[in-house]
Interface confidence: low
């Protein structure tokens, strides 16, 4: 359905409010360093132009593509070269290369100041003074720090953000009402950003086929009563939505996501019995709810998979006729029977099945060759099961903070070249798998844990890609999307690593640590732990534990002292000397 004016089409479909919000998100995700006011000006100009096209689709430039219109607008920014350097070269290109160029320059770790939360009264005053600007600022700050944030979902977050301020700024105890809500939005937002980053990495680095395979597995688990054709249709539509969002086509993405939600709700009888509540909600809530909906019950009496995929004499014929369709059916059938498996495990099984058919369908006796293919699945299933069992036991024994520390040591020894802030961030997130997943019963542990670990390890991969320092990380990140976690798990201590020179400055602490929040204090201690391991990669657990216990005691003692700064200076020197002795530095 070709439209004379794409910009008018999207403006009419989305409405002015969503149109403006999505254009702001798009611009902030591309030009992450630009001041808020500059972006608002650009958005207003685009919006005014869109309105002229709504009034007359034949008006000048209204027939231009959105990439052309938006790219032209971004390229009017006066300080492009000073602020962004070589990104300015993108403006010399034509579409679609110009957009590809902008995408290439998205920065997963932009050099932006940490967002500091003002006092509640200050925030409430700002909210009341100019609600529209306040909410736009929220979209802008999140979008520029998370350049792949799923735009239609960010609109949902903004709606909840607004609701929190509307409710809490008139509450008796504003802080008690507001702060927990903001904490929840922050944590959910970080998780949402990381999940979407994996989808975009999957599409951009491993291609549409990889993403579609992931989607077949996940949707088949979620909608096990749906027919394969129905799941295939949903996968095709979902792939289009995420391809658009990951490609910066946010207006099309939001529009198509709304269409998909509409389709799912109109056809819920043939999709899932769990959608009823979601489908009664307004659009943004509806789409979010569908994306998070629990798995439907498995149909009763599903036949054994072996009949169609091992015992049938037509296996090779069916495979040869339409390889991806046949493998898709295998993945669908396996996934709908196994909500207890992680998506990445299901994809490993499908890959093993594919490899076996590739080999066996060319053999003299194909059936004899692939007859035992399901036996090859056993070790693949047991590996994550055992790993999760061991790590949940360790988590239950240590608690989250010390479990994170164990992972910090483990991962620093595996890939010591990686920057300390990245190791701390990634290991802390890996450690959260314990409190997130170990509470679940056995049947839900693996999909929770391994699919969460895929998201966290992708953070490591995208951060490392910006400044690659470790061949081992590059190898695990690029060889196979579904084997990233087993690849990292299999890494041993890097014997080629030359320990870092000891630098006392790294272990010098000041009284400001005493005023930090518990989380910030943990991060300081964990940063020191990573640095210790980088200095002494062969240090034993016991040695590191002793040093960290001494360090915790030192911080506690000096934070209670009358003259804190003197205590940190004098006791700090003693701690460094004692640590050097303990570790033989």
């Amino acid at each position: 359905d070709a439209h004379k004016s794409e910009v008018a089409h999207r403006f009419k479909d989305l409405g002015e409010e969503n149109f403006k919000a999505l254009v702001l998100i798009a611009f902030a995700q591309y030009l992450q360093q630009c001041p808020f006011e500059d972006h608002v000006k650009l958005v207003n100009e685009v919006t005014e132009f869109a309105k002229t096209c709504v009034a007359d689709e034949s008006a000048e430039n209204c027939d231009k593509s959105l990439h052309t219109l938006f790219g032209d607008k971004l390229c009017t920014v006066a300080t492009l070269r000073e602020t962004y350097g070589e990104m300015a070269d993108c403006c010399a290109k034509q579409e679609p290369e110009r957009n590809e160029c902008f995408l290439q320059h998205k920065d997963d770790n932009p050099n932006l100041p940490r967002l500091v939360r003002p006092e509640v009264d200050v925030m409430c005053t700002a909210f009341h003074d100019n609600e529209e600007t306040f909410l736009k600022k929220y979209l802008y700050e999140i979008a520029r720090r998370h350049p792949y944030f799923y735009a239609p979902e960010l609109l949902f977050f903004a709606k909840r953000y607004k609701a929190a301020f509307t409710e809490c700024c008139q509450a008796a105890d504003k802080a008690a009402c507001l702060l927990p809500k903001l904490d929840e939005l922050r944590d959910e937002g970080k998780a949402s950003s990381a999940k979407q980053r994996l989808k975009c990495a999957s599409l951009q680095k491993f291609g549409e086929r990889a993403f579609k395979a992931w989607a077949v597995a996940r949707l088949s688990q979620r909608f096990p009563k749906a027919e394969f054709a129905e799941v295939s249709k949903l996968v095709t539509d979902l792939t289009k939505v995420h391809t658009e969002c990951c490609h910066g086509d946010l207006l099309e993405c939001a529009d198509d996501r709304a269409d998909l939600a509409k389709y799912i709700c109109e056809n819920q009888d043939s999709i899932s019995s769990k959608l009823k509540e979601c489908c009664e909600k307004p659009l943004l809530e509806k789409s979010h709810c569908i994306a998070e909906v629990e798995n439907d019950e498995m149909p009763a009496d599903l036949p054994s998979l072996a009949a169609d995929f091992v015992e049938s004499k037509d296996v090779c014929k069916n495979y040869a006729e339409a390889k991806d369709v046949f493998l898709g059916m295998f993945l669908y059938e396996y996934a709908r029977r196994h909500p207890d498996y992680s998506v990445v495990l299901l994809l490993r099984l499908a890959k093993t099945y594919e490899t076996t058919l590739e080999k066996c369908c060319a053999a003299a006796d194909p059936h004899e060759c692939y007859a035992k293919v399901f036996d090859e699945f056993k070790p693949l299933v047991e590996e994550p099961q055992n790993l999760i069992k061991q790590n949940c036991e360790l988590f239950e024994q240590l608690g989250e903070y010390k479990f994170q520390n164990a992972l910090l040591v483990r991962y620093t020894k595996k890939v010591p070249q990686v920057s300390t802030p990245t190791l701390v961030e990634v290991s802390r997130n890996l450690g959260k798998v314990g409190s997130k997943c170990c509470k679940h019963p056995e049947a839900k542990r693996m999909p929770c844990a391994e699919d969460y670990l895929s998201v966290v390890l992708n953070q490591l991969c995208v951060l490392h890609e910006k400044t690659p320092v470790s061949d081992r990380v590059t190898k695990c990140c690029t060889e196979s999307l579904v084997n990233r976690r087993p690849c990292f798990s299999a890494l041993e201590v890097d014997e080629t690593y030359v320990p870092k020179e000891f630098n006392a400055e790294t272990f010098t602490f000041h009284a400001d640590i005493c005023t930090l929040s518990e989380k910030e204090r943990q991060i300081k201690k964990q940063t020191a732990l990573v640095e210790l391991v980088k200095h002494k990669p062969k240090a034993t657990k016991e040695q590191l534990k002793a040093v960290m216990d001494d360090f915790a005691a030192f911080v506690e003692k000096c934070c209670k002292a009358d003259d804190k700064e003197t205590c940190f200076a004098e006791e700090g020197k003693k701690l460094v000397a004692a640590s050097q002795a303990a570790l033989g530095l």
Partner: nanobody, 116 residues
């Protein structure tokens, strides 16, 4: 260790042809989309063409459309770029890279010079 080794470049007259190859090792070649990108003297990287893992989906920049053809041989772990009707503005170092249009090259590249 991921390795991409480009070859096949050289000096050619305008209107001439060249076929570039990229030998891949250290990763599962058949599972990855691949691209060719180029860098002209004193310029940034420019995306030229991409092909998906199966080889059935190919894309080209406007500047080479109709003249260049990307292909791959998954059995040989090799990516190709057939370049016909070459122009002086095609002069550049050509690199192959893992991934789509946003891919970053990691090999040494192969020099293509189009000049009479």
């Amino acid at each position: 260790q991921v390795q991409l080794v480009e070859s096949g470049g050289g000096l050619v007259q305008p209107g001439g042809s060249l076929r570039l190859s990229c030998a891949a090792s250290g990763f599962t070649f058949r599972g990855f989309g691949m691209s060719w990108v180029r860098q002209a003297p004193g310029k940034g990287f420019e995306w030229v063409s991409s092909i998906n893992s199966g080889g059935e989906d190919t894309r080209y920049s406007d500047s080479v459309k109709g003249r260049f053809t990307i292909s791959r041989d998954n059995a040989r772990n090799t990516l190709y770029l057939q370049m016909n009707s070459l122009k002086p503005e095609d002069t550049a170092v050509y690199y192959c890279a893992i991934g789509g249009a946003g891919a970053t090259p990691s090999g040494q590249g192969t020099q293509v010079t189009v000049s009479s």
